[in-house]
């Protein structure tokens, strides 16, 4: 099961916020709220499923109260008229404290889960399809709002002349290069649903969609470096990044980041001073820790080029080298759809980018 | 691949502290919520805390809250079990477990891994 | 708390037999709810999650079901590495998030 056509997330949405889930609620759909209850004003907040702006029609009102030792509310509200409050009497969330909350849609019941916990399961009293809306208040601060769809959905694939599981194909290199073999990786459920070629003829950085023709080849002008460009729907199960390039002959060391907001969630880092690849993930100017483990020798040379093709799945990502799959690297932020910036910089020259 | 090591049991007077360790590998604590499991001799499964490190969230057992405090240093991917004022009914192995919540496209409502536990006794 | 009630605590059962465990939970748990193996001095191990899924390289004779607020865990046909204690567990948030079934020893007839 790949997510396809994710909706982009909401990145830190001033509240009240309210925003379109595009093409309203489906069975499946995984929807999280990311932030932080404040600790000054207010005892309430609310999270709300919703037909339109006006609030009149709630399909699922999620109200955590900071009253009367905590409790969470949980209704539906039909042409302005509140229905029966079922209650949890068990508060999962704290004042001054951030939060996860992941609402999965199904076809009988919301569940609820609060920081990794499943918390309450909310029966539908009216038709979710209707829900075309999320919309937060109260006293709380958002970091993001993102929505993952698992289905399966046949589109026409970006690399339309090139079955997924077939060598991608990279511009020219100077050396003889190995293109990916057949079955390095199985072939995906389902294929990628756009791509984007990152060129820089007339515009550094500038980028154009090529939702269903091959990837196109372009001449190798260089990139501005640090290359900075935004993931467009963040990263989903068989999202794929591909990156070609050389390393300068005096190269140290260089990085290719996919980040999220002030995050980094995957630090690639070649370090040719230490004959390394250090990969890590950084929260709130936080280091993880490192892993650099390799099944073969240093993949990358100083004065050569190289590719390398990031595939994300649902645990994991995984990296190929010259079409060699050289690690996996488990998910430490797992809301993809937030991961949406992709930052290169160090001692390389850039020479394709797609994402 | 997986793993999850505890380490720091041993013997230890009642109203004495001991600090237990779980160290991870293969996966990383930050996105994913740990607990301690305890199991007294010849009884069954008791759950005993967790941490969701990700948004700093934490819950305990009735049986210990107040006395155990978990923690996590996602910089050492390790998580800790600080076990304050011990009573001989805390006598047991603990065990360290990650809960998945979230693979494949699918909610995953148990504990996929375990590490090997590690025994304390508290006894005078 | 949300309590789970196991029964029966033991059983005995020839190699073959089809061999039924079940967990009542004192109030809705919605599907989550897992069942675990453990043989003496090991760790318990995940064998169905969320109610009825078969968690990875489990073998298929086992298999997990929900009816309401009662959970069963089947062993179509026993072998001999499946003598061991079977426990339920549900992770719905109440005061004690986590919570197991008193256990099923399954021993040898």
């Known amino acids: 099961m790949a997510f396809s056509g994710s909706q982009a997330p909401y990145l830190s949405p001033a509240v009240p916020f309210s925003g379109t889930i595009q093409g309203g609620l489906q069975d499946g759909l995984q929807i999280t709220v990311n932030g932080t209850v404040l600790s000054s004003s207010g005892t309430r907040f609310a999270v709300n499923f919703q037909t339109g702006f006006s609030g009149n029609d709630i399909a699922f009102h999620f109200n955590p109260r900071f009253e009367d030792g905590g409790y969470v509310v949980c209704n539906t509200r039909q042409n302005g008229s509140w229905g029966p409050e079922e209650r949890k009497t068990h508060m999962p969330f704290q004042k001054g404290m951030p939060f996860d909350l992941c609402f999965l849609v199904q076809s009988s019941d919301f569940k609820v889960m609060v920081n990794g916990i499943l918390f309450v399961q909310y029966f539908h009293r009216v038709p979710f399809h209707r829900v075309d809306t999320i919309s937060v208040n109260g006293s709380v601060q958002l970091s993001y709002i993102s929505f993952q769809n698992p289905r399966t959905v046949p589109v026409q694939p970006a690399f339309s002349t090139v079955p997924f599981s077939q060598p991608v194909c990279f511009p020219p290199r100077p050396r003889g290069r190995r293109q990916k073999p057949p079955g390095v990786w199985p072939a995906n459920p389902a294929p990628i649903t756009q791509t984007v070629i990152h060129t820089v003829q007339s515009a550094p950085g500038q980028m154009f969609s090529t939702p269903a023709i091959p990837p196109m080849m372009y001449p190798h002008p260089a990139y501005p470096m640090p290359f900075i460009t935004t993931i467009l729907g963040g990263l989903y199960p068989s999202k794929s990044i591909l990156l070609s390039g050389t390393v300068l002959p005096s190269a140290q060391r260089f990085h290719i980041n996919l980040c999220s907001g002030n995050h980094i969630a995957f630090h690639l880092n070649p370090r040719f001073d230490e004959n390394a690849v250090v990969r890590n993930t950084q929260i709130d100017n936080s280091w993880g820790s490192e892993e650099r483990s390799l099944p073969r020798k240093m993949p990358f040379v100083r004065g050569q080029s190289f590719s390398v093709w990031i595939l994300c799945e649902a645990h994991c990502l995984k990296v190929a080298v010259d079409g060699q799959h050289l690690f996996e690297y488990y998910h430490r932020l797992r809301n993809l759809p937030t991961i949406n910036r992709l930052e290169v910089g160090g001692d390389i020259q850039l020479t394709h980018v797609q994402t | 691949e997986v793993q999850l090591v505890e380490s720091g049991g041993g013997l230890v007077q009642p109203g004495g502290s001991l600090r237990l360790s779980c160290a991870a590998s293969g996966f990383t604590v930050s996105s994913s919520s740990i607990h301690w499991v305890r199991q007294a001799p010849g009884k069954g499964l008791e759950w005993v805390a967790y941490i969701y490190p990700y948004s700093s969230s934490s819950s305990y057992a009735d049986s210990v809250k107040g006395r155990f405090t978990i923690s996590a240093d996602t910089s050492k991917n390790t998580a800790y079990l600080q076990m304050n004022s011990l009573r001989a009914e805390d006598t047991a192995v603990y065990y360290c477990?990650?809960?998945?919540?979230?693979?494949?496209?699918?909610?995953?409502?148990?504990?996929?891994?375990w590490g090997q536990g590690t025994l304390v006794t508290v006894s005078s | 708390d949300i309590q789970m009630t196991q029964s029966p605590s033991s059983l005995s059962a020839s190699v073959g037999d089809r061999v039924t465990i079940t967990c009542r939970a004192s109030q809705s748990v919605s599907s989550a709810v897992a069942w675990y193996q453990q043989k003496p001095g090991k760790a318990p191990k995940l064998l169905i999650y969320?109610?009825?899924s078969l968690y990875s390289g489990v073998p298929s004779r086992f298999s997990g079901s929900r009816s309401g607020t009662d959970f069963t865990l089947t062993i179509s046909s026993l072998q001999p590495e499946d003598f061991a204690t079977y426990y339920c567990?549900?992770?719905?948030?109440?005061?004690?998030?986590?919570?197991f079934g008193q256990g099923t020893k399954v021993e040898i007839k």
């Open positions: 477990a990650r809960y998945s919540t979230y693979s494949s496209s699918k909610w995953v409502w148990g504990m996929d891994y």
């Open positions: 969320s109610a009825s």
């Open positions: 567990q549900q992770s719905y948030y109440d005061s004690n998030p986590i919570t």
